[in-house]
Amino acid sequence: AFGISGVQKYTRALHDSSITGISPITEYLASLSTYNDQSITFALEDESYEIYVEDLKKDEKKDKVLLSYYESQHPSNESGDGVDGKMLMVTLSPTKDFWLHANNKEHSVELHKCEKPLPDQAFFVLHNMHSNCVSFECKTDPGVFIGVKDNHLALIKVDSSENLCTENILFKLSET
């Protein structure tokens, strides 16, 4: 499995990093599934959206998510990279005006309706193997990633005690 690289080495003040442009550098419509090929689906229930991790039936259509990619500058005192220290941050929107948010207090992932500019809780640092196998690290809580727990999305702390081959924080992106 793909491991998140040396998380303990780079627990860094992501919330000090700045999005370098108000507009995304690119956007990508994709379905999101877990490393074990379960689909991430979104259902409107009582005027709010619920997020599920489930096996789809054979011909069932996968839900799509709009991933918007933003460039973000490392805090220069952190990275040592100067102007070169760029990360990719993403926001994930399954439907108009709703975005995935990190609720760090509850260790949960929620869908919130909001207007731009989006709050920091809606931004995730992109880690990837290729563009079709990724992990999402909370901008507001370095070392914490979107993951799968009990058939739901949750926030999962990845630290040195784990061997960093954590399949439950890996997601696949596909066009189908």
């Epitope: 040396g6 780079y10 070169d84 990360m87 990719l88 640092v125 193997m129 563009s131 690290e137 960093l164």
Partner: antibody, heavy 121, light 106 residues
Framework: EVQLVETGGGLVQPGRSLKLSCVAS????????MYWIRQAPGMGLEWVSS????????YYLDSVKGRFTISRNNAENTVYLQMNSLRSEDTATYYC??????????????WGQGTLVTVSS | DIQMTQSPSVLSASVGDRVTLSCKAS??????LDWYQQKVGEAPKLLIY???NLQTGIPSRFSGSGSGTDYTLTISSLQPEDVATYFC????????FGQGTKVEIK
């Protein structure tokens, strides 16, 4: 300023081995994916191998799988390409490159000057 | 595996001309495409990333566009220093270069 300096190229006989090194400076090496790309004389560019930040994941061009090994030493800011069972078709300038973004395998933002490997008897 | 096909192989144009280079992918690559410039005797240099984003320090006469399988690099007003070979490169699935387009001055 980002700098990548490749060494280790030279003339080698078919079937023999060679180890290329690339020393990096000017950026936080352990944050970035690193790559080897080659270019045969008068030909185009060909991606050869990739390694993620901590060296735990490596990827290879099919024609070099089982013969080449990419590795890195983050303490020494160095990425390596161990090339075994060399063939004449491996003759090329080998470039080391750095990823564009921390933690992501997108784009080659910076390149070294290249080191020439000639496989010939 | 994704194949990248560039056209033309060689392009000859006059200084000041608008020049268009094409790159076609064998599958949808979702704008995960770069353009690199390589001058004779030099290492390649990143010009454009994610289809249409200009790398820092690259002149604004260079621009990129495209989506799906079809991508374009445009030089709005060709300059003598633009003589080089241009490579497209996809990173949507694996890593693959096109074979290159050599740009010459007439």
């Amino acid at each position: 300023e980002v700098q990548l300096v490749e060494t280790g190229g030279g003339l080698v006989q078919p079937g023999r081995s060679l180890k290329l090194s690339c020393v990096a400076s000017g950026f936080t090496f352990s944050n970035y994916w690193m790559y080897w790309i080659r270019q045969a004389p008068g030909m185009g560019l060909e991606w050869v191998s990739s390694i993620n930040n901590d060296g735990g994941n490596t990827y290879y061009l099919d024609s070099v799988k089982g013969r080449f090994t990419i590795s890195r030493n983050n303490a020494e800011n160095t990425v390596y390409l161990q090339m075994n069972s060399l063939r004449s078709e491996d003759t090329a300038t080998y470039y080391c490159a750095k990823g564009h973004y921390s933690y992501s395998s997108y784009s080659f933002a910076n390149w070294g000057q290249g080191t020439l490997v000639t496989v010939s008897s | 595996d994704i194949q990248m096909t560039q056209s033309p192989s060689v392009l000859s144009a006059s200084v000041g001309d608008r020049v268009t280079l094409s790159c076609k992918a064998s599958h949808n690559i979702n704008k995960h495409l770069d353009w690199y410039q390589q001058k004779v005797g030099e290492a390649p240099k990143l010009l454009i990333y994610f289809t249409n984003n200009l790398q820092t320090g690259i002149p604004s006469r260079f621009s990129g566009s495209g989506s799906g399988t079809d991508y374009t690099l445009t030089i709005s007003s060709l300059q003598p220093e633009d003589v080089a070979t241009y490579f497209c490169f996809q990173y949507n699935s694996g890593w693959t270069f096109g074979q290159g387009t050599k740009v010459e001055i007439k």
